[in-house]
Interface confidence: low
């Protein structure tokens, strides 16, 4: 009878195993092993008993030992099990920002690890397990399904193999997986609110904001403000679940014309874009041109207003015979149009809004030296003694220099409160002197004597 | 300033292919660029454009048969899976400096011809 | 789905004279139209932008009109080298809509 030591042996895989070969008759014919694994004999004393060294095991392995006696040949295996931890445990790849709401499909695949009857798979968030499978088939997969909610934001998961040997003596080999860090989002189907001026002037600013409401986590929202293909710096402040992006944005000559305001909110793997068209315009203020500012008493006098050629104008509350961008006014010019405002108005259309530009510019008209008699009498009698101001007013563009002489030296005292005297008496030559001329007028003072009773 | 496209060919159905426009002159980061096609004696369709930021937009013909992505001196236009009906010079052209617009085009490439053929 | 009709498809005219090419739109752009012309071998050239305005370099030959959904390109005082095909392009609205479009050409043979 023939029989083998260990009959089952565990070993890690490699490995190297001792094996005893007996057989109960004295003088065995035949004592030997049978297997395809490198074997190296000990030489023992006897003829009954034989050691073999089998090693580098790498599969599950049945040697066989053999002996021929007398009463014929018989044969017992022994069992040869081996161990290994599993060469990859893997969590198929997935996009680290996930949807709320969304169905996560978490795969783990296992290649490698015996014996198979010892090894389990478990799925797992954070400590939490959420599924256990025996690995199966080569690669093991082991899947499930989570439904993605806002607090998984951050959460880890990963992929176990358990290698349970305890039962056969052993200890419990775990192999874990690198973790996949979930980053959840929400980003509303609604897109972004976009608030700005619908028309810009060039070489003016103006402000954009750009604001959306339930966001998570709102922190990680990426905000990209452009008008046309110039890119605006926002500051943007955040609530809970809200943010509200504002850009100072300056406008040039070179960007005159119809421009697209782009706001674009990118959040996890999703974007929501709102698009707006702002009108950028040139349109100075109107032009007011005098044919002279300052002109004679007399003269004709041009006024025009010049504005954008699209702008439609008012000169002085007329509006431009025919409706447009130009109009003006003929006049001769009197005393009374000396300081005349000429205001022109220009109205310009630009996206379906009314833009005011205003220009004025004042006439300066020369005339005079004028002396009449309502500012300059020709003729006083006051009583002696009394206290009077003699007026006289000289009129004028600019304003005239007065005197008024009695035999061409004795001044009559204008505008000044003087005692009424005889030697105040007499005719006098008022003389008003301007750059535009010259004129005369004679003033006779009379002094009343005072009767004596 | 000036554009040039590169790496048209032959080549046979269903083998991916990517055209290169490279630019000089001016910054990418500044403008949006256009890709338009014009097959042999016909007319001019618009592909999609990429914005300064990277950003690429499609029109609704062109959605999943092309890609366009850019480094800083280059945009590049991928067919995904050409057919015969791919067959077509293909333009890169900026826009974005009257009114702003992406879609007003005042610079163009010369074309490249791409013939695909089994 | 945005369409840009142009007609005629070819016209033909002598030196010294007028043509006129129509650009319709299914729907309202606004005065968002472009022309551009383009010769043999070569790529287009911008000729007109916001339906009117000229863009730099270009011959005042050259005359854009129209607003809405009906446009049109006026080359007055014909030359040969005017000879040419002429697209016209929609850039309102967004890519999926009607930017971008361009219409189908009118080929401008001058005899």
């Known amino acids: 009878q023939t029989s083998v030591s260990p009959s089952k042996v565990i070993l890690p895989r490699g490995g190297s195993v001792l094996v005893t070969c007996s057989t109960s008759c004295d003088q065995p014919k035949l004592l030997g092993i049978e297997t395809p694994l490198p074997k190296k004999e000990l030489l023992l004393p006897g003829n009954n008993r034989k050691v073999y060294e089998l090693s580098n095991v790498q599969e599950d392995s049945q040697p066989m030992c053999y002996s021929n006696c007398p009463d014929g040949q018989s044969t017992a295996k022994t069992f040869l099990t081996v161990y290994w931890t599993p060469e990859r445990v893997e969590l198929a790849p997935l996009p680290s920002w996930q949807p709320v709401g969304k169905n996560l499909t978490l795969r783990c695949q296992v290649e490698g690890g015996a014996p198979r009857a010892n090894l389990t798979v478990v799925l797992l968030r954070g400590e939490k397990e959420l599924k256990r499978e025996p690995a199966v088939g080569e690669p093991a997969e082991v899947t499930t399904t989570v439904l993605v909610r806002r607090d998984h934001h951050g959460a880890n998961f990963s992929c176990r193999t358990e290698l349970d040997l305890r039962p056969q003596g052993l200890e419990l080999f775990e192999n874990t997986s690198a973790p996949y860090q979930l980053q959840t989002f929400v980003l509303p189907a609604t897109p972004p609110q976009l608030v700005s001026p619908r028309v810009l002037e060039v070489d003016t600013q103006g402000t954009v904001v750009c604001s959306l409401d339930g966001l998570f986590p709102v922190s990680e929202a990426q905000v990209h403000l452009a008008l046309g293909d110039q890119r605006l710096n926002p500051t943007v402040t955040y609530g809970n679940d809200s943010f509200s992006a504002k850009a100072s944005v300056s406008v040039t000559a070179e960007d005159e014309g119809t421009q697209r305001l782009t706001c674009a909110v990118i959040l996890g793997n999703q974007s929501q874009e709102t698009l707006q068209t702002v009108t950028i315009y040139s349109f100075p203020a109107p032009n007011v041109i005098l044919t002279k500012p300052e002109v004679s008493e007399g003269t004709e006098v041009t006024v025009k207003c010049e504005a954008h050629p699209r702008a439609k104008v008012t000169l002085n509350g007329v509006p431009a015979q025919p409706l447009g961008p130009r109009a003006q006014l003929l006049l001769k010019a009197t005393p009374e149009d000396n300081g005349r405002s000429f205001s022109c108005s220009a109205t310009l259309e630009v996206a379906g809004q009314l833009i005011h530009k205003n220009q004025t510019r004042e006439l300066r008209v020369l005339y005079g030296p004028r002396l009449d008699e309502r500012d300059c009498p020709g003729n006083w009698t006051w009583p002696e003694n009394s206290q009077q101001t003699p007026m006289c007013q000289a009129w004028g563009n600019p304003l005239p220099e007065l005197k008024c002489l009695k035999d061409g030296t004795f001044p009559l005292p204008i505008g000044e409160s003087v005692t009424v005297t005889r030697d105040l008496e007499g005719t006098y030559l008022c003389r008003a002197r301007s750059t535009q001329g010259e004129v005369t007028r004679k003033v006779t003072v009379n002094v009343l004597s005072p009767r004596y009773e | 300033q000036s554009l040039e496209e590169s790496g048209g060919r032959l080549v046979t159905p269903g083998t991916p292919l990517t055209l290169t426009c490279t630019v000089s002159?001016?910054?990418?980061?500044?403008?949006?660029m256009s890709w338009v096609r014009q097959a042999p004696g016909k007319g001019l369709e618009y592909i999609g454009w990429?914005?300064?930021?990277?950003s690429a937009y499609y029109a609704n013909w062109a959605k999943g048969r092309f890609t366009i992505s850019k480094t800083s001196t280059t945009v590049d236009l991928k067919i995904t899976s050409p057919t015969t009906e791919d067959t077509a010079t293909y333009f890169c052209a900026r826009g974005g400096d009257y009114g702003g617009s992406t879609y007003i085009l005042n610079l163009w490439g010369p074309g490249t011809l791409v013939t695909v053929s089994s | 789905a945005f369409e840009l009709t142009q007609t005629p498809s070819s016209v033909e005219a002598a030196v010294g004279g007028t043509v006129t090419i129509k650009c319709q739109a299914s729907e309202s752009i606004d005065s968002y139209l472009s022309w551009y012309q383009q010769k043999p071998g070569q790529p287009p050239k911008l000729l007109i932008y916001?339906?009117?305005t000229l863009a730099s370099g270009v011959s005042s030959r050259f005359k854009g009109s129209g607003s809405g959904t009906e446009f049109t390109l006026t080359i007055s005082d014909l030359e040969s080298a005017d000879a040419a095909t002429y697209y016209c392009?929609?850039?309102?609205?967004?890519?999926?809509?009607?930017?971008?479009?361009f219409g189908g050409g009118t080929e401008v043979v001058v005899k």
């Open positions: 916001a339906a009117s």
């Open positions: 990429i914005s300064f930021s990277g």
């Open positions: 002159g001016f910054s990418l980061s500044s403008y949006g």
């Open positions: 392009q929609s850039y309102s609205g967004t890519i999926t809509t009607s930017g971008g479009a």
